[in-house]
């Protein structure tokens, strides 16, 4: 979970505990079981550039 | 440019333990996945894991999970696998994969692979 | 687990000709998101496995355009157009939808 008194994610991203910090949504493109990407599920990514794995 | 370079061949004996070391360079070591890969002798790909180095999050295979344990030194952007009670059937080449999580990602980078063979 | 498997596993070749494997998914590849986490590999002899196709269709950076895949949700190919002498090597299939990460079999290619 996100550290009590931290800002949210802005807008197109969420949050990752595995990373430790806030992530582009559009990056569930690349690998979609991130574990940042249940939190992206609700809202639309931002513009993306589809590329590799 | 982006390498990942791994330590050297090992030969272990039965019931040892063996720490396999892949050295990062060429990017933000704490930024990408480390994956693990094992290749049997002529044999195919079986992952064991993956450690994202900043927090030392870890995922393993089920097969894998208290064989291998995988840690990271994000001072000399180094991955570590370490196998224990090893068995003639932990004989193989350990691969260290970089894995991403980003869409402006081009490609994967692997390291050139360890030899462990287990013997008496 | 999703499983993957391959086929052929032997797959001789004559250099010009075209190859073709095929790669099967236990689960359907294809996310919410309309892609299909289908990824191809070639494993050189003595080498790393290097990324040949990425999102069932997508040529990696670097790999000639005689490669190309296809497929739908479970059944996949990977085309050769006209084989070089230095496509020999394992083919891998794999997908990246979730953990844990699954390869097939390999298919052996090799020149005839």
């Known amino acids: 979970e996100q550290a009590p008194g931290t800002a949210p994610c802005s807008r197109g991203s969420s949050w990752s505990a595995d990373l430790d910090k806030c992530m582009d949504c559009a990056s569930c493109r690349a690998r979609p079981h991130s574990d940042f990407c249940l939190g992206c599920a609700a809202a639309p990514p931002a513009p993306f550039r589809l590329l590799w794995p | 440019q982006v390498q990942l370079v791994q330590s050297g061949a090992e030969v272990k004996k039965p019931g040892a333990s063996v720490k396999v070391s892949c050295k990062a360079s060429?990017?933000?070591?704490?930024?990408?996945?480390i994956a693990w890969v094992k290749q049997a002798p002529g044999q195919g790909l079986e992952w064991i894991g993956e450690?994202?180095?900043?927090?030392?999050?870890?995922y393993y295979s089920e097969k894998f999970r208290g064989k291998a344990t995988l840690t990271a030194d994000t001072s000399t952007s180094t991955a570590y696998m370490e196998l224990s009670s090893l068995r003639s059937e932990d004989t193989a080449v350990y691969f260290c994969?970089?894995?991403?999580?980003?869409?402006?990602?081009?490609?994967?980078?692997w390291g050139q692979g360890t030899l462990v063979t287990v013997s008496s | 687990d999703i499983v993957m498997t391959q086929s052929p596993l032997s797959l001789p070749v004559t250099p010009g000709e075209p190859a073709s494997i095929s790669c099967r998914s236990s689960?359907?590849?294809?996310?919410?998101?309309?892609?299909?986490?289908l990824y191809w590999y070639l494993q050189k002899p003595g080498q790393s496995p290097q990324l040949l196709i990425y999102?069932?269709?997508n040529l990696a950076s670097g790999v000639p355009d005689r490669f190309s895949g296809s497929g739908s949700g479970t059944d996949f190919t990977l085309k050769i157009s006209r084989v070089e002498a230095e496509d020999v090597g394992v083919y891998y299939c794999?997908?990246?939808?979730?953990?844990?990460?699954?390869f097939g079999q390999g298919t052996k290619v090799e020149i005839k």
């Open positions: 994969a970089r894995r991403t999580i980003y869409y402006d990602y081009d490609g994967d980078y």
């Open positions: 060429g990017y933000t070591f704490t930024d990408f996945i």
């Open positions: 450690i994202y180095p900043g927090t030392g999050r870890t």
């Open positions: 689960k359907s590849l294809l996310h919410s998101n309309g892609i299909t986490y």
């Open positions: 999102q069932m269709s």
């Open positions: 794999a997908h990246n939808l979730e953990l844990p990460w699954t």
